[in-house]
Structure formats: structure tokens, C-alpha cells
């Protein structure tokens, strides 16, 4: 058993250009804190897969709020270590990941919002008991300097934390056979550590992994009394010869458990019983329960009461991932139909629709021309979201409203005058042009079958409407 | 502004199953987390349980063999059935909207007094 | 489950006096996920404090949570008539939430 200690020494915009100048959204103040979780062997693993050596959370660091002038290198940051105990051998090799988590702490409906800020993996070989290891590693623009070290609790010591120790029996050596344990001065090493599960009392052994009996008990773990005895009839684990070996091959020979679980027989197989955070038939499932506190950004654990039991996070709506850890880009799903803006309140999805679309997504064609009156004898046009009126001759504007000059647009060509009649404009052409607009030209044989103006009118004539 | 509406039977006869809906008004169900929760008389709150618009759902321990939530988000709403009732099972029950923060209720019914007799 | 376990069952005062209301759990309560509500007879519960200490939407600022782990208060300075009513915690750590068991404040 040990402790894996992490000291984060600062974290901070990295060097070079758009480095970010400040943690916090623009809702307003944060303060910062850290994950550590630990991953046994050097595979990479899934960011999901769980932290089978074990995982941490840091305090909350102080409140940050970003000032105009550009801002410390250094971000405020959580007092004290992180530490992740671990109850078996320290493996050695591991995966460190260090998550750099943001609390929003402006006016989020609902209450603070949680998200990820950084996120450094890192594959490394680490032996207990030694210095501080340092380490600066950077995620996007930011950049994480700490140290980290692994240690063993007594009366483990060693490099993995498998060597037991217990207190000198006499004040100048060990007792017999023992050597001192380093670097511990004051301790020995322990007997062999026997196989897990032995009786502490009716068993012994002389090499890791065994468990040898007393005399009158039996059983692959010195549990059970023996009827009768083949054992020699010294009393005491003084020699080799003292009690039994294990009689047999049974289903727990070579302790099928992992990760330090214990065996007990039943009847034609095993049984193991997981220390926690382990679980499956042979201990071999890494667990986290809900007691871990392994949701974030409030979700609910559901399961995982305890390690037999895998846990799941409800995520709230805008949260995704294992652990709720991501925020969902909700907006990514084009939710708004017709044409809608999409935007993300965080608490709910709002949809702002254009003109002619109602409804929570836009849903909804609204008719364009309900109570949309065209003026002026006008007709009302639907089309594409959004009322068009087609207005009666003389008069324009979205509805109809305008008086219009049909010939303020020089319709006539190549000098043609323009008259304003009832039915539309008329065009008295320059001689050599006819046509409606006076466009073609006259064969020089030909003769304008337009007269030079229509009945009724008189060129020049201010614009009337008969 | 959010509103939560029960609507049901006030008086079940017991073995039947108690069934109540809950029209929310204000809010998209598609939005939220959706919950009931009972008080029997003069007694506290007691979790029934939740549902999401995706049918993800969540019940208590105690109830869990009696319980089915569904929603219809067609009709903004979302239903209680708990089977085999007895009188252990009269009480107020609430509709409440889950926050997006967590789930705690931060919008309530009125809530809707199911009385189990015969 | 989390059993959450609300002290003193009652609790008799004046107004204009302070209150401060006990929530302790069975097990620690991860992150602070914990609110409290109030009750007025024939009421429903209202919403006041989540995450232990954050006020929710329109609560007056008399009303404060604060506490972590398993011990949890919240604390009404400067007593209202309105707020004489039944008080309870909920936790929505692990399923399945669950509420204390309440504390009536009465008026003395």
C-alpha cells in the first residue's frame, strides 16, 4: 500500500501567439481545480476506461476574474497535493492523466457550470520511495507545470511497495535471518508474505504465495480442522518440517483472484472476494463506485453502490460522456428547421425563426398572408416565408401602398414616349421603332402601325389614371 | 413562466394501479429531466422517480417492481402508473421538473391527493 | 442509499431571530450536491438553496446553505412570518435521491 502524491506548481497560457488570455468565459468569474486519475501499464487506454490505480480531485482554487491589462502568467490555484492512495503494489509503469477542470461561477441558470479545460496523458516509469519527478506538459494553448512521486506506507517499502517491515526485535539487529530494511534503518524485513487469505493463525509460510498448516487444520487457506492428522507433531513454525503442504491441487492453487483479492473454495470451483474498487469473477474489472463522486456538471450516479456493481452518470441535458464530462454542442445537431438560428442557453435550446416560421424548432409554416391586407386592390403572395404583395397597376411598395409612376423607369426605348393608362404604359415610338416598348426597328419599307398617340391622351400630358 | 399541472383519479381502490399524468406548460419536455414525487399525509417527500424524453428512466429501489414513467412529447406530457396499490400509497403526488444543474426539482406542481380505498 | 437525517425535528422562534437548520448524511455527499426546500401547508415544495450553498431564482438572501461531506446547514438570518414552514434537504449525488425527514419551524 502506498500514496501517489501530485503537486501542480502552476498552469498558465503556454508561450506563442493565441495563447488564451484568461480561463473564463465570458459569463463571467471561475476558479480552477484538478483531476488526477491513474491507470495501471503503459497501453493507452480509452479516456473513459476507469482509474483502476485510482483518482483524485483538488479543492476548489480561488475565484479568478479576468482584469483589462493582460494577466498573470500563473493562474490562482488550489493549496496542497493530490493524493491517490493505492492499496496493492505500485505497478511502475502507469498512465498519469491530470484534467484541468473550469467552475463558472457567473449567473448560470441553475447554478455553477462545469467544463474541461485541459487535459494532459502522459505514459511514464515511476519507482516508489523515489525523489519528486518533474514534469511540464502542454494541452492546446495551455501549459501544466508539476511534480509527482509515489510512496509506500509502512510497513510496506520498496520499489512496489510488496516488501513488508515490521520493528527491529532487538535494539542492535534484526532477529535472525532478517536483514534491515531500507532505507528504513530502524526496521527489518518481514517473513514471506503468504498466500492471500492464509490463516493468520493456523498457517505459515516460508516463500511468497504459500500457505502452509499447523497441525490439526487443513484446507488450502489453513481454514478447515482436520479429523485426522498425518501433520508431524511439532507445535510451532520452527523448521521446514513444521506443519502440512497444501494436500492436493485445489480451485484456488496459484490464486486465480487479481488485484489482490482473496479465494475461498466452493463447492467443484472458486470464489474471489474483491478489495474495493475491483470486481468480476476474478477481480480482474477495475471499479469506481458512487461513492467516488464520479459524475460531474451535476450528473446523478445510478448503480455502483459497491464495487460488484458498475456505476453509470445521468447526465443533465447539455452533458455528455462516462463521467458527464463533456458539454454537449447541441446547437452540432441543427435542431432549428427552416432556416432557424440556432442558440444554446446552456439550461435550453432556443430556436429564433425567421420570418413566417413559428414553433419551439421552427416547426410551424405560419400562413403568410393571414392578416396581411395588400391595399390598393393588391393580392397577397405567399412564398418561401415571407407574404408578397402583387399589386394593382399604379400602385407599389411592400403593401401596395405607394402610388407608382409606371413610366419612371424610361420603359420606352430609342425615344419613345411613355404614356400612364389604366391597363399599364403605353409607348408612342420615335419614327423607324415599334413594338411595346418600342424595340424594333421599322424595315425602311415598312410603316409605324402605332398611331403617335393613343386616343385620349396628350404627350407630355402629366401622368393621369383613367 | 413553467408550469406543471397533475391530472388523475383522486381515489384508486386498492390492488389497481394508480395512474396520473402531468401536463407541463412553459417549458420544452424535451428539455428536461421529469420526476414525480409523493408525500403521504402529515409525512415528508419520497422520490418516485424520472424520466427523460430519450425513455431514459430512473426509480426508486422501493418502488421500482410497481412503477412505469413515460412521457409523450408530442403532448407535453409525462405519466405515473404504479400497479398493485394499497393504502400505504395514498398520499399527494407532485410532478416536478429536474434542474439543469443537478437533480433537485426547481419547478413544482400543485401536486394531486390519490386517496387508495375500497 | 444516502439517508439524510434532519435536526431538531422542530424548531420554535421568534421573528426577527435567526435559525439554523441541521442536514447530516449516512455517507459523504459528493460536490456538495445538496438542496434544500421549503413547505408551507397545502403547498408544494419551493426550491431555495442547490449545491449546498448557491440560492436559487428569486430566494432572498437571508436564506443561506453552507457545510460539505455530510454535514450540511442551512441558516435563515432575521426570521419572516413567511418563513415559518417545514424545511427539508435532498440529496442528488447517487440514486436514489432522497429527502431528510424535515424540520418544522413553528413561531414561538
Known amino acids: 500500500a502506498g500514496v501517489f502524491e501530485l503537486q501542480i506548481h502552476s498552469f498558465g497560457p503556454g508561450p506563442g501567439p493565441g495563447a488564451p488570455r484568461s480561463p473564463c468565459s465570458a459569463r463571467g468569474p471561475c476558479r480552477l481545480f484538478f483531476r488526477v486519475c491513474l491507470k495501471p501499464g503503459l497501453s493507452e487506454e480509452a479516456a473513459e476506461s476507469p482509474c483502476a490505480l485510482g483518482a483524485a480531485l483538488s479543492a476548489r482554487g480561488p475565484v479568478y476574474t479576468e482584469q483589462p491589462e493582460a494577466p498573470a502568467p500563473d493562474l490562482p490555484l488550489p493549496n496542497g497535493l493530490l493524493q491517490v492512495p493505492f492499496r496493492d503494489a505500485w505497478p511502475g509503469t502507469f498512465s498519469l492523466i491530470i484534467e484541468t477542470w473550469r467552475e463558472e461561477l457567473g449567473d448560470q441558470i441553475g447554478g455553477p457550470a462545469w467544463s474541461l479545460l485541459a487535459r494532459v496523458t502522459r505514459r511514464r516509469r515511476l519507482a516508489a520511495g523515489g525523489p519528486w519527478a518533474r514534469d511540464i506538459q502542454r494541452a492546446g494553448a495551455w501549459e501544466l507545470r508539476f511534480s509527482y512521486r509515489a510512496r509506500c506506507e509502512l510497513p510496506a517499502v520498496g520499489t512496489a511497495c510488496t516488501r513488508l517491515c515490521r520493528p527491529r526485535s532487538a535494539p542492535s539487529r534484526c532477529g535472525p535471518g532478517l536483514r534491515p530494511c531500507a532505507p528504513l534503518e530502524d526496521e527489518c524485513e518481514a517473513p514471506p508474505v503468504c498466500r492471500a487469505g492464509c490463516s493468520l493463525e493456523h498457517g505459515f509460510c516460508e516463500q511468497p504465495g504459500e500457505c502452509r498448516c499447523l497441525e490439526g487444520w487443513t484446507g488450502p487457506l489453513c481454514m478447515v480442522p482436520a479429523s485426522t492428522s498425518s501433520c508431524l507433531g511439532l507445535r510451532g513454525p520452527s523448521s521446514a518440517t513444521t506443519g502440512c503442504l497444501v494436500p492436493g491441487p485445489g480451485p484456488c492453487d496459484g490464486n486465480p483472484c487479481a488485484n489482490g483479492g482473496s479465494c475461498s473454495e466452493t463447492p467443484g470451483s472458486f470464489e474471489c472476494t474483491c478489495p474495493r474498487g475491483f470486481y468480476g469473477l476474478r477481480c480482474e474489472v477495475s471499479g469506481v463506485t458512487c461513492a467516488d463522486g464520479p459524475c460531474f456538471n451535476g450528473g446523478l450516479c445510478v448503480g455502483g453502490a459497491d464495487p460488484d456493481s458498475a456505476y453509470i452518470c445521468h447526465c443533465p441535458p447539455g452533458f455528455q460522456g462516462s463521467n458527464c464530462e463533456k458539454r454537449v454542442d447541441r446547437c452540432s445537431l441543427q435542431p432549428c428547421r427552416n432556416g432557424g438560428l440556432c442558440l444554446d442557453l446552456g439550461h435550453a435550446l432556443r430556436c429564433r425563426c425567421r420570418a413566417g416560421f413559428a414553433g419551439p424548432r421552427c416547426e410551424h409554416n405560419l400562413d403568410d398572408c393571414a392578416g396581411r391586407a395588400c391595399a390598393n386592390g393588391g393580392t397577397c403572395v405567399e412564398g418561401g416565408g415571407a407574404h408578397r404583395c402583387s399589386c394593382a397597376l399604379g400602385f407599389g411598395g411592400r403593401d401596395c401602398r405607394e402610388r407608382a409612376d409606371p413610366c419612371a423607369a424610361r420603359p420606352c426605348a430609342h425615344g419613345g414616349r411613355c404614356y400612364a393608362h389604366f391597363s399599364g404604359l403605353v409607348c408612342a415610338c420615335a419614327p423607324g421603332y415599334m413594338g411595346s416598348r418600342c424595340e424594333f426597328p421599322v424595315h425602311p419599307d415598312g410603316v409605324s402601325a402605332l398611331p403617335a398617340a393613343p386616343p385620349g391622351l396628350r404627350p407630355g400630358d402629366p401622368q393621369r389614371y383613367l | 413562466q413553467v408550469q406543471l399541472q397533475e391530472s388523475g383519479p383522486g381515489l384508486v381502490k386498492p390492488s389497481e394501479t394508480l395512474s396520473l399524468t402531468c401536463t407541463v406548460s412553459?417549458?420544452?419536455?424535451?428539455?428536461?429531466?421529469w420526476s414525480w414525487i409523493r408525500q403521504p399525509p402529515g409525512k415528508g417527500l419520497e422520490w418516485i422517480g424520472y424520466?427523460?424524453?430519450?425513455?431514459?428512466?430512473n426509480y426508486n429501489p422501493s418502488l421500482k417492481s410497481r412503477v412505469t414513467i413515460s412521457v409523450d412529447t408530442s403532448k407535453n406530457q409525462f405519466s405515473l402508473k404504479l400497479s398493485s396499490v394499497t393504502a400505504a400509497d395514498t398520499a399527494v403526488y407532485y410532478c416536478?421538473?429536474?434542474?439543469?444543474?443537478?437533480?433537485?426539482?426547481?419547478?413544482w406542481g400543485q401536486g394531486t391527493l390519490v386517496t387508495v380505498s375500497s | 442509499e444516502i439517508v439524510l437525517t434532519q435536526s431538531p425535528g422542530t424548531l420554535s422562534l421568534s421573528p426577527g431571530e435567526s435559525a439554523t437548520l441541521s442536514c447530516r448524511a449516512s455517507?459523504?455527499?459528493?460536490?456538495?450536491?445538496l438542496a434544500w426546500y421549503q413547505q408551507k401547508p397545502g403547498q408544494a415544495p419551493r426550491l431555495l438553496i442547490y449545491?449546498?450553498?448557491s440560492r436559487a431564482t428569486g430566494i432572498p438572501d437571508r436564506f443561506s446553505g453552507s457545510g460539505s461531506g455530510t454535514d450540511f446547514t442551512l441558516t435563515i438570518s432575521r426570521l419572516e412570518p413567511e418563513d415559518f414552514a417545514v424545511y427539508y434537504c435532498?440529496?442528488?449525488?447517487?440514486?436514489?435521491?432522497?429527502f431528510g425527514g424535515g424540520t418544522r419551524l413553528e413561531i414561538k
Open positions: 449545491g449546498a450553498s
Open positions: 455517507q459523504s455527499v459528493n460536490k456538495n450536491y
Open positions: 424520466i427523460y424524453y430519450s425513455g431514459t428512466t
Open positions: 416536478a421538473r429536474i434542474a439543469v444543474a443537478g437533480f433537485f426539482f426547481d419547478y
Open positions: 412553459g417549458a420544452s419536455i424535451s428539455s428536461f429531466y
Open positions: 435532498q440529496q442528488y449525488d447517487r440514486s436514489p435521491l432522497t
